[in-house]
């Protein structure tokens, strides 16, 4: 799978994580920080 950094408009897309652009799937993906989950890393869990 080809990946690159997300475009600058997506800077705020991932609330607690890193935004990755999955080129072949035409979608943005959030790699969440430890303790966070959800499509956009918006949920905190213990």
């Amino acid at each position: 799978v080809s990946i690159t950094k997300c475009n600058s408009d997506m800077n705020g897309y991932c609330l607690h994580g890193q935004c990755i652009y999955l080129v072949d799937m035409s979608q943005n993906y959030c790699r969440c920080e430890v303790g966070y989950t959800g499509v956009r890393c918006e949920h905190f869990y213990l």
Epitope: T4, N7, S8, G12, Y21, Q27, V39, R40
Partner: antibody, heavy 116, light 106 residues
């Protein structure tokens, strides 16, 4: 199956406002950005602005600043685009477009006619 | 706002011809360009995103290339069903469409 279903055609008088809705099904709009694009008859595509429904943050094209308002109701999974002070040049098909979780999934379009 | 200058605005070519459309951005858009096809009365159809990535179901005669500010869209062998208007879209910093290119058969 993911869908963006827009409200029906509207006829408005110059100076009035119009509010177009865009209801999402099959996905949560909080996971996406919702863009708005318009196309006047026989003309090209024009990006108007977008909303991040999760953060409730908006960005508008300079040309529309102060005249367009994009909102989202996450409880009903619906986005809205309101355009005020309508003029004849605003006659166009207005599209909502999902971006973020996938690349640019389009609604069916809403024709807004501005005529006296 | 980033400006996208698309050329030509229209072209006429024969079936089987190679067709090339260009888009120039007013600043580096880091390969974040997409190409759409639109037929009369229809919503735009995404053909290519991230400069050269073909969408599923799109024929391989369509291709894209470029980097920095200069991008190219090519139809290697024009078919009658390719008659449409084509638009580039930059999506690096917000969004801007090119003015469109109307492709007709000679």
């Amino acid at each position: 199956q993911d869908q963006l279903v827009q409200s029906g055609a509207e006829v408005k008088k110059p100076g009035a406002s119009v509010k177009v809705s865009c209801k999402a099904s099959g996905f949560n709009i909080k996971d996406t950005y919702i863009q708005w694009v318009r196309q006047a008859p026989g003309q090209g595509l024009e990006w108007m602005g977008r909303i991040d429904p999760l953060r409730r943050s908006t960005k508008y094209r300079e040309k529309f600043e102060g005249r367009v308002t994009i909102t989202a109701d996450t409880s009903t999974n619906t986005a809205y685009m309101e355009l005020s002070s309508l003029r004849s040049e605003d006659t166009a098909v207005y599209y909502c477009v999902r971006s973020g979780t996938s690349f640019d999934f389009w609604g069916q379009g809403t024709l807004v006619t501005v005529s006296s | 706002d980033i400006q996208m200058t698309q050329s030509p605005s229209s072209l006429s070519a024969s079936v089987g011809d190679r067709v090339t459309i260009t888009c120039k951005a007013s600043q580096d858009i880091h390969k974040y360009i997409a190409w759409y096809q639109q037929k009369p009365g229809q919503a735009p159809r995404l053909l290519i995103q991230y400069t050269s990535t073909l969408q599923p179901g799109v024929p391989s005669r369509f291709s894209g290339s470029g980097s920095g500010t200069d991008y190219t869209f090519t139809i290697s062998s024009l078919q009658p069903e390719d008659i449409a208007t084509y638009y580039c879209l930059q999506y690096d910093n917000l969004r801007t469409f090119g003015g469109g290119t109307k492709v007709e058969i000679k």
